[in-house]
């Protein structure tokens, strides 16, 4: 009588997840009696995964009709497979008894399951910087199998080059995860500016997933700020101009001393935006030469995205009765930096 | 249709010998382990002899050395030669299918009576 | 020889009753166990197999339940065409045994 052989064809199989794996077997022998059991794992742990003599398993059915006597083939059918499923099944047959004796497995067959990775979500970082400053923006994605992957950094369509990544676990697993992080110098220019993290498994058919981060999260352009005086009208009031430009976010709070004192306070909002993203803003501020006695100094304080405000000065000269004065004059930068005035975005 | 037919059953004398047949259609008899079960009259089931898809064969200790279990995979059917018979294998005989993979019995045949007195 | 030992040997119910007939082996069995119905002048019919699987065409009314030693038939809705003998069976090693049998009686 020739041995009972437990025929298992395939080595590995591999599977989208979401898609049906099927698990072959046959043997060459349907003698002894008893029932053909199937496993993933092998040895004392090992989990039942279909029994053809009983047990209710509903993602499981045979391939062929287990209720036909001359049928040798048990093959099974795994539906909606996912991650968890990964693992090597045995197809193993029982002489029938109490309890059946085990007497012989099949070789084993892998079943690996392709899982696409989740779209990829970038983050940047918890506080704005300044241009030439580095900031540092992390890509996560997850639940993918198998663990090889590729994943690339662009800003606007350069591909970055300074970036460190990581897939873990290092061993072997159902699934993996991907987190990387992209460290990018800011400049200027950079409010419209997008980094895009770029992630290709061969779940994705050559068409690779995109996460994107825009740089106008990351960044702070600080204002430049120039005070000017137009010419003295009619009526002794001289006109101040206190030009901000460049500035982004918007989120800006203007204050006008004179001599010192609070005269104004305005808050920037719905501004019209320049080319490159960033703000301007003009505020003007008549001052009445003829109720001062003294040189009136006048300073522009901008406190820009809660940032230690920024002053520029200019004085007024009250003895020169300049009611001739045809041409703005600019102020000077003070460069003081007075304490912080927290005001609303506009 | 799946079905099972006995024949083969009468009067016989103690001492002598009856051969009893099973006719099985709509099913491939030599591939299902297959018995027989009798049934004294106003008694329980008793199962008598088996015999596997090997032709390996299998007897309840009273019949050992006088009964023997065959089939006949050209005919699809099985036998059940009965010699030496006594009063005590008076019975209705059932030629039973042993089910798929752990041989449970699923299918019977209607039966046919043995009756051994002199 | 394993033994079955079913009990009770009869019983009487009525219609709409639920009743259940034990079966003890001498020895476990794992779930090879059957149980089988038969009418007068009948050939049984095959009811359970590995001790809860319902062969096809049994009404859902009859369950089997237990694995070793000890196993149970359930009817859970009597109607008049259940009043019959009932058998249990090992069918674990040769030589396959029956119980004695239960004969169900209407009340």
């Known amino acids: 009588e020739e041995e009972l052989q437990v025929i298992q064809p395939e080595k590995s199989v591999s599977v989208a997840a979401g898609d049906s794996a099927t698990l072959n077997c046959t043997v060459s022998s349907l003698i002894p009696v008893g029932p053909i059991q199937w496993f993933r794992g092998a040895g004392p742990g090992r989990e039942l995964i279909y029994n053809l003599k009983e047990g209710h398993f509903p993602r499981v059915t045979p391939v062929s009709d287990p209720t036909k006597r001359n049928n040798m083939d048990f093959s099974i059918r795994i539906s909606n497979i996912t991650p968890a499923d990964a693992g090597t099944y045995y197809c193993v047959k029982f002489r029938k008894g109490s309890p059946d004796v085990e007497l012989k497995s099949g070789a084993g067959t892998e079943l690996s399951v392709r899982a696409k990775p989740s779209a990829p979500v970038v983050s940047g970082p918890a506080v704005r910087a300044t241009a030439e400053h580095t900031v540092s923006f992390t890509c996560e994605s997850h639940g993918f199998s198998p663990r090889d992957i590729t994943l690339k950094w662009f800003k606007n369509g350069n591909e970055l080059s300074d970036f460190q990544t990581n897939v873990d676990p290092a061993g072997k697993s159902v699934s993996y995860s991907i987190r990387s992080t992209a460290r990018v110098v800011l400049t200027r220019r950079d409010v419209h500016s997008q980094v895009i993290c770029e992630v290709a498994h061969v779940t994705l058919q050559g068409d690779p997933l995109r996460g994107t981060a825009n740089l106008s999260e990351a960044i702070r352009v600080p204002p430049f700020l120039e005070v000017t005086q137009q010419s003295m009208r009619a009526d002794n009031q001289v006109n101040v101009t206190c030009q901000v430009t460049k500035f982004y976010p918007q989120r800006l709070q203007l204050t006008w001393l004179e001599n010192g004192n609070v005269s104004r306070t305005e808050m920037a909002s719905a501004l019209p935006e320049n080319k490159d993203g960033t703000y301007n803003w003009t505020s003007w501020l008549l001052v009445n030469v003829s109720a001062h006695r003294d040189d009136v100094k006048l300073t522009c304080q901008v406190e820009h995205d809660g940032q230690p405000a920024v002053n520029k000065s200019f004085s007024v000269k009250v003895s020169a009765h300049p009611k001739e004065q045809g041409s703005n004059t600019a102020a000077e930068n003070t460069g003081t930096n007075e304490r912080n005035i927290y005001g609303g975005s506009g | 249709e799946v079905q099972l037919v006995e024949s083969g059953g009468g009067l016989v004398q103690p001492g002598g010998s009856l051969r009893l047949s099973c006719a099985a259609s709509?099913?491939?008899?030599?591939?299902?382990?297959m018995h027989w079960v009798r049934q004294a009259p106003g008694k329980g089931l008793e199962w008598v002899s088996a015999?596997?898809?090997?032709?390996?064969?299998y007897y309840t200790g009273s019949v050992k050395g006088r009964f023997t279990i065959s089939r006949e995979n050209a005919k699809n059917s099985l036998y059940l030669q009965m010699n030496s018979l006594r009063a005590d294998d008076t019975a209705v005989y059932y030629c039973?299918?042993?089910?798929?993979?752990?041989?449970?019995?699923?299918?019977w045949g209607q039966g046919t009576m043995v009756t051994v007195s002199s | 020889d394993i033994q079955m030992t079913q009990s009770p040997s009869s019983l009487s119910a009525s219609v709409g009753d639920r009743v259940t007939i034990t079966c003890r082996a001498s020895?476990?069995?794992?779930?090879?166990a059957a149980w089988f119905q038969q009418k007068p002048g009948k050939a049984p019919k095959s009811l359970i197999y590995?001790?809860?699987s319902l062969h096809s065409g049994v009404p859902s009314k009859f369950s089997g339940s237990g694995s070793g030693t000890d196993f149970t038939l359930t009817i859970s809705s009597l109607q008049p065409e259940d009043f019959a003998t009932y058998y249990c069976?090992?069918?674990?090693?040769?030589?396959?045994?029956f119980g004695q049998g239960t004969k169900l009686e209407i009340k």
């Open positions: 039973v299918r042993g089910g798929v993979w752990d041989d449970a019995f699923d299918i």
């Open positions: 709509g099913f491939t008899l030599s591939s299902y382990d």
């Open positions: 015999i596997g898809t090997a032709g390996d064969t």
């Open positions: 020895q476990g069995i794992n779930n090879y």
């Open positions: 590995t001790a809860s």
């Open positions: 069976q090992q069918y674990v090693s040769y030589p396959y045994t």
